[in-house]
């Protein structure tokens, strides 16, 4: 599985390195963390236990999405 990979970037265009996920059952993982009044920070990569999740906090919001097709 080929996934885009990055750590704590503010732009999707800075998340275009490609990582080869070699473990059985891995998925592509994207986390978007938005702090109130600030930019959204994006992280992507391979994840063995990815679960779609969305949480609202007093200071912002965290959104995790999982997918399992190449470059999804």
């Amino acid at each position: 599985l080929l996934c885009y990979s990055c750590k704590a970037q503010v732009s999707n265009e800075d998340c275009l390195q490609v990582e080869n996920c070699t473990q059985l059952g891995e998925q592509c993982w994207t986390a978007r963390i938005r702090a109130v009044g600030l930019l959204t920070v994006i992280s992507k990569g391979c994840s063995l236990n990815c679960v779609d999740d969305s949480q609202d906090y007093y200071v912002g919001k965290k959104n995790i999405t999982c997918c399992d097709t190449d470059l999804c």
Epitope: Y4, T69, L71, C72
Partner: antibody
Framework: QVKLQESGGGLVQPGGSLKLSCVAS????????MSWVRRTPEKRLEWVAY????????YYPDTIKGRFTISRDNAKNTLFLEMSSLKSEDTAMYYC???????????????WGAGTSVTVS | DIQMTQSPSSLSASVGDRVTITCRTS??????LNWYQQKPGKAPKLLIY???KLNSGVPSRFSGSGSGTDFTFTISSLQPEDIATYYC?????????FGGGTKVEIK
């Protein structure tokens, strides 16, 4: 309405070069990843190139890698395919296509241009 | 690469007939399969995505089914306007690949 219009095809000699263009209209071009797909004279469909929304990442099948270059100009809503070292087996109708997502993982080519013909002979 | 084997390569049927096309993949692709229709001189058109989802504006006589490596595309009652070549395509793994096509003709 949503439309893709290719141009730039023609007759070229083996080893020659050609640059195809595709103008998009009716949608926010910069929000979509795009691809080129070709239909060979044997009526086979082959995916030939992919480009990310902003143009920062491209991908090609091994048969194409190093010979074709996909690029885009989001300010002009235009997709390009620069083809070099052309071979007779590159003879085909070339289509510009939009990639649309269904959910997080699944996608499909939902919009196609009318195509532009490339003959290498 | 994932090989897509479509059968038959061509078929001839009468108006009103039920037509079935199969697509077999060399690896498990879950439900990540699309079907396209291409009429002579025209661009391909999306009919079905994610194995069984009908694209908007596509008549309900078209349907899809399957999972894993075996998929089926059906026209429940063939109409004259259905004369075309039909292709399956997998969107799971790069390079993205298409079946060889099935040419449908009217008897």
């Amino acid at each position: 309405q949503v439309k893709l219009q290719e141009s730039g095809g023609g007759l070229v000699q083996p080893g020659g070069s050609l640059k195809l263009s595709c103008v998009a209209s009716g949608f926010t071009f910069s929000s979509y990843t795009m691809s080129w797909v070709r239909r060979t004279p044997e009526k086979r469909l082959e995916w030939v190139a992919y480009i990310h929304n902003g143009g920062g990442h491209t991908y090609y099948p091994d048969t194409i890698k190093g010979r074709f270059t996909i690029s885009r100009d989001n300010a002009k809503n235009t997709l390009f395919l620069e083809m070099s070292s052309l071979k007779s087996e590159d003879t085909a109708m070339y289509y510009c296509t939009r990639r649309m997502y269904y959910g997080n993982s699944h996608w499909y080519f939902d919009v196609w241009g009318a195509g532009t013909s490339v003959t290498v002979s | 690469d994932i090989q897509m084997t479509q059968s038959p390569s061509s078929l001839s049927a009468s108006v009103g007939d039920r037509v079935t096309i199969t697509c077999r993949t060399s690896q498990d692709i879950s439900n990540y399969l699309n079907w396209y229709q291409q009429k002579p001189g025209k661009a391909p058109k999306l009919l079905i995505y994610y194995t069984l989802k009908l694209n908007s504006g596509v008549p309900s006589r078209f349907s899809g089914s399957g999972s894993g490596t075996d998929f089926t595309f059906t026209i429940s009652s063939l109409q004259p306007e259905d004369i075309a070549t039909y292709y399956c395509q997998q969107s799971k793994t790069l390079p993205w690949t298409f079946g060889g096509g099935t040419k449908v003709e009217i008897k």
